[in-house]
């Protein structure tokens, strides 16, 4: 039997894919759980596998079409349960009414490229990948650049308060390799969370000019 | 058995407000997922407000900012309190509770009230 709390948190992609986290203390053990989707207005249904990500947490990922279809809309309601194997039965252990548009976590940005470095400055862009169009320019960016000696967490935050996907950074130091992450986010949705980061993009600021010999 | 019970129907002007109650007899110590839905006059079924067993809210957009679904845990009562009423909300009402795991609790199991009209004149 299963007491204790239990957290089913999910997450739309804003295209195809709406991934799903659940934990549970005092869970089941050795037992195989699913996420079903529902749409109240939709032909379709699907169902996806959990798989273990630590103690008392299982994770995964619904995958509702090709990834940039737009399978749902701000006006889709998807009851989402989390059903657990138990001999012949599923039992069902939790269930929301899930509003896509509300809970919102895009992909990571991709495509990082420097664009121009100098001795101080360097220019990068990117891009976002399987965003909706629905979005059109509403959406907003984090960005952070990696210094030698310091940790990412130490690292100050630039935010980029509209779709922009490029940065100048300033005040480099010459000829020092650096790393660059960014981060995506609609500005819609009462539970919209950012992205993940995307993979670092390394560079290094060029060597200050040589003074002439005198 | 599990027993619902739908009242607090009936016919109003637009603009006035109506509650509706939900009361699920049996099984009080279960958690449960409980849900109104609507059927207005040839119309198919739609969603319109669900409270979770952790209290999560969901609404429709098109009743967003104007229902508010409460629950009474102890005897498990639902309520949606319906504000601004227009003609577009004129339908059958049915509310439906979900039964989640726990000992002696008939989990996976959906129960649907009679449902209770609601009429919202011009």
């Known amino acids: 039997a299963v007491n204790g709390t239990s957290q089913f948190t999910c997450f739309y992609n804003s295209r195809a894919n709406i991934s799903c986290v659940w934990s549970q203390d005092g869970a089941l053990q050795d037992t195989s759980c699913q996420v079903h989707a529902w749409p109240d207005r939709r032909r379709w249904n699907q169902t996806c596998e959990l798989l273990p990500v630590s103690q008392a947490s299982w994770a995964c990922n619904l995958i509702l079409g090709a990834p940039d279809s737009q399978k749902l809309t701000t006006v889709d309601i998807v009851t989402l349960r989390v059903l657990c194997r138990e001999g012949v039965r599923w039992r069902v252990m939790a269930i929301q009414d899930f509003k896509p548009f509300e809970n919102l976590r895009l992909m990571a940005p991709i495509s990082l490229q420097v664009v121009h470095v100098e001795t101080h400055r360097c220019n990068i862009s990117w891009e976002i990948s399987q965003a909706s169009h629905y979005f059109e320019r509403h959406l907003e960016f984090e960005a952070r650049t990696l210094s030698p000696g310091h940790t990412w967490e130490e690292a100050p935050l630039l935010t980029l308060k509209q779709k922009q996907e490029w940065i100048c950074l300033e005040t480099l130091t010459p000829d020092t390799q650096y790393e660059f992450q960014v981060r995506v986010k609609p500005l819609q949705g009462e539970f919209t969370t950012w992205s993940p980061w995307s993979q670092p993009l390394a560079f290094r600021t060029k060597p200050a000019a040589l003074g002439k010999d005198t | 058995q599990v027993q619902l019970q739908e009242s607090g129907g009936g016919s109003v002007q637009a603009g006035g407000s109506l509650r509706l109650s939900c009361a699920a007899s049996?099984?009080?110590?279960?958690?449960?997922?409980m849900t109104w839905y609507r059927q207005g006059p040839g119309k198919e079924r739609e969603f319109v407000s669900s409270?979770?067993?952790?209290?999560?809210?969901t609404y429709a957009n098109s009743v967003t900012g104007r229902f508010t679904i409460s629950r009474d845990n102890a005897n498990h009562t639902v309520y949606l309190q319906m504000n601004s009423l227009s003609p577009e909300d004129t339908a059958m009402y049915y509310c439906?509770?979900?039964?989640?795991?726990?000992?002696?609790?008939?989990?996976?199991?959906?129960?649907w009230g009679q449902g209770t009209q609601v009429t919202v004149s011009s």
């Open positions: 439906k509770t979900e039964y989640l795991y726990g000992l002696g609790c008939p989990d996976g199991s959906a129960y």
């Open positions: 049996g099984y009080e110590y279960c958690r449960i997922h």
């Open positions: 409270i979770g067993s952790d209290g999560r809210k």
